[in-house]
């Protein structure tokens, strides 16, 4: 069974600047789960509200 998201391919190991890359199966694209204190599509911005 393939889950809704899983590990990104190796080509995207550096895709997320301050977060973890997850492959969105339904949308067929990589996405980022940001570490605490970071925001942005690729977790590239420090969250000034954190």
């Amino acid at each position: 069974v393939v889950s809704h998201f899983n590990d990104c391919p190796d080509s995207h190991t550096q895709f997320c600047f301050h977060g973890t890359c997850r492959f969105l199966v339904q949308e067929d694209k990589p996405a980022c789960v940001c570490h605490s204190g970071y925001v942005g599509a690729r977790c590239e911005h420090a969250d000034l509200l954190a």
Epitope: V2, N6, D7, P9, D10, S11, F15, D28, K29, R42
Partner: antibody
Framework: VQLQQSGAELVRPGASVKLSCTAS????????MHWMKQRPEQGLEWIGR????????KYAPKFQDKATMTADTSSNTAYLQFSSLTSEDTAVYYC????????WGQGTLVTVSA | DIVMTQAAPSVPVTPGESVSISCRSS???????????LYWFLQRPGQSPQLLIY???NLASGVPDRFSGSGSGTAFTLRISRVEAEDVGVYYC?????????FGSGTKLEIK
């Protein structure tokens, strides 16, 4: 997402050429930009990709010393420069973005001729 | 590098019939996450390539369901049922698993 590529180029052997690919309705910093080569009546070759957010690049080995990819995030534009051009570089060059290449530019024809 | 092989340079087909286009990879495209990173494109004459199938068997947005993809880790098939005149062009497979990404040499669909 739309990718608009620069116009056709006629260049001399030994010269360089710089092609552009400008994105609309999409921030190029949000994903990698890829470049492909297609020689006349031939197949597609992946040249490489650039991460516009930090300038990091990956090249196919055969293009490592031939191609240079750059990006300007202020103009939302990616560039491909080819150096020391020969007749083998006569081709259409495409930019494409997003995983799986759902979005392609219209291509730029580069003709190398004396 | 992963080598993608499309053995048939061209396939002739009569409109309304079905056709299958094959592609092989020199290495399995099945990632440990369970996804198979094999993609199919159609390049119509004078146009840019268009994504048809993603991850081996998923239909891209806006693509008619006459197109379908199947396969294993190294052998893949694109099937077109009820071929129409607008399906003419060159079909390419692409491995999107690892750098350098590589395309098959293409298979030209020709109407008889």
């Amino acid at each position: 997402v739309q990718l608009q590529q620069s116009g056709a180029e006629l260049v001399r052997p030994g010269a360089s050429v710089k092609l552009s690919c400008t994105a609309s309705d999409f921030n190029i910093k949000d994903d990698y930009m890829h470049w492909m080569k297609q020689r006349p009546e031939q197949g597609l070759e992946w040249i490489g990709r650039i991460d516009p957010a930090n300038g990091n690049t990956k090249y196919a080995p055969k293009f490592q010393d031939k191609a240079t990819m750059t990006a300007d995030t202020s103009s939302n534009t990616a560039y491909l420069q080819f150096s020391s051009l020969t007749s083998e570089d006569t081709a259409v060059y495409y930019c494409a973005t997003s995983w799986g290449f759902p979005y392609w530019g219209q291509g730029t024809l580069v003709t190398v001729s004396a | 590098d992963i080598v993608m092989t499309q053995a048939a340079p061209s396939v002739p087909v009569t409109p309304g019939e079905s056709v299958s286009i094959s592609c092989r990879s020199s290495k399995s495209l099945l990632h440990r996450n369970g996804n198979t990173y094999l993609y199919w494109f159609l390049q119509r004459p004078g146009q840019s390539p268009q994504l048809l199938i993603y991850r081996m068997s998923n239909l891209a947005s806006g693509v008619p369901d006459r197109f379908s993809g199947s396969g294993s880790g190294t052998a893949f098939t694109l099937r077109i049922s009820r071929v129409e005149a607008e399906d003419v062009g060159v079909y390419y497979c692409l491995q999107h698993l690892e750098y350098p990404y590589t395309f098959g040499s293409g298979t030209k669909l020709e109407i008889k």
